[in-house]
Amino acid sequence: QEEDLPRPSISAEPGTVIPLGSHVTFVCRGPVGVQTFRLERDSRSTYNDTEDVSQASPSESEARFRIDSVREGNAGLYRCIYYKPPKWSEQSDYLELLVKESSGGPDSPDTEPGSSAGPTQRPSDNSHNEHAPASQGLKAEHLY
């Protein structure tokens, strides 16, 4: 019987509000033994895959997806999935990347810490939430 794969988690360094032209790194985490991590934006059809997987702890592996110079087109909802043979996991929660014009003001920090791992509430009417998952065989429209 195939094991039930835990859902991955996703976070962003240094945060989820990034000034135009700055860098951001998405960190996807899953169990040990992951062969491929996939970072999706908005839809399964827009993704990047990596097999550059490192061990983050004895029970956890991770992959890092870096965008060197963030553009407005990088804004959106991101999530991770992974492939641990012989199957794909379910999707992580979504993480929203906001791209803002640099203000440089001392009282307004450029970034906010961002991660998305646990369950979220069902969207209320004013929710700024949306939903999507893992996929094989779709043509990649690369993120960056």
């Epitope: 908005d42 399964r44 827009t46 087109g73 929203e96 969207p123 949306e130 939903h131 998952p133 094989q136």
Partner: antibody, heavy 119, light 107 residues
């Protein structure tokens, strides 16, 4: 709070039409809006989506050449349709799509607007 | 393009009984699946999202399961009001594909 479609009606074959999805009591900020149609006696058929978080548009392969989804304001999304044929006769729905965790939630549907293509 | 195959196309069941509707995705869609109920002249009504999460206000007689490519909707303790057409849908905004529907008749 609701979304309402308008702009349907009777159109001649090869004609064009623009449908509007208007939010009432909320704006579409950071949601996605999708258009779905349903021909008489048939099942729903996805047409296109507009993502407010990324400003990206997504289309069913059959719809790409004749349908255009656009955001016209924070409370309005339109669907432009060209070269219409009898096969496009259907009720057209817009749906507001939120997120729940890592999955999308198509929870709010308008009542639909009927488009009839006939000479 | 992703295809959602729904079975059976129609089913008849008795009040108080149980029905199971299956939906198969042509590619792995993880948990991105919703189930809808539709009655004539109305838009689809969301019953279940994320494959197994019950929409607010929907009776617990409705349940969903599955992940990846195989999904199931189960309706137990059937009532006359459950007579309708049921659809599965891939909820990804880049796909949005619906199954062909299952017409449920209550006898």
């Amino acid at each position: 709070e609701q979304s309402v479609e308008s702009g349907g009606g009777l159109v001649q074959p090869e004609g064009s039409l623009t449908l509007t999805c208007k939010a009432s009591g909320f704006d579409f900020s950071r949601n996605a809006i999708c258009w779905v149609r349903q021909a008489p006696g048939k099942g729903p058929e996805w047409i296109a989506c507009y993502s407010f978080s990324s400003s990206a548009t997504y289309y069913a392969s059959w719809a790409k050449s004749r349908f255009t989804i656009s955001k016209t304001s924070s409370t309005t999304v339109t669907l432009q349709m060209t070269s219409l044929t009898a096969a496009d006769t259907a009720t057209y729905f817009c749906a507001r799509v939120d997120i729940y965790g890592g999955s999308r939630y198509w929870g709010m549907w308008g009542p639909g607007t009927l488009v009839t293509i006939s000479s | 393009e992703l295809v959602m195959t729904q079975t059976p196309a129609s089913v008849e069941a008795a009040v108080g009984g149980t029905v199971t509707i299956k939906c198969q995705a042509s590619q792995n869609i993880g948990g991105d699946l919703a189930w809808y109920q539709q009655k004539p002249g109305q838009p689809p009504k969301l019953l279940i999202y994320r494959a197994s999460t019950l929409e607010s206000g929907v009776p617990s007689r409705f349940s969903g399961s599955g992940s990846g490519t195989e999904f199931t909707l189960t309706i137990s303790d059937l009532e006359c009001a459950d007579a309708a057409t049921y659809y599965c849908q891939d909820t990804d905004i880049g796909s949005g594909a619906f199954g062909g529907g299952t017409e449920l008749e209550i006898k």
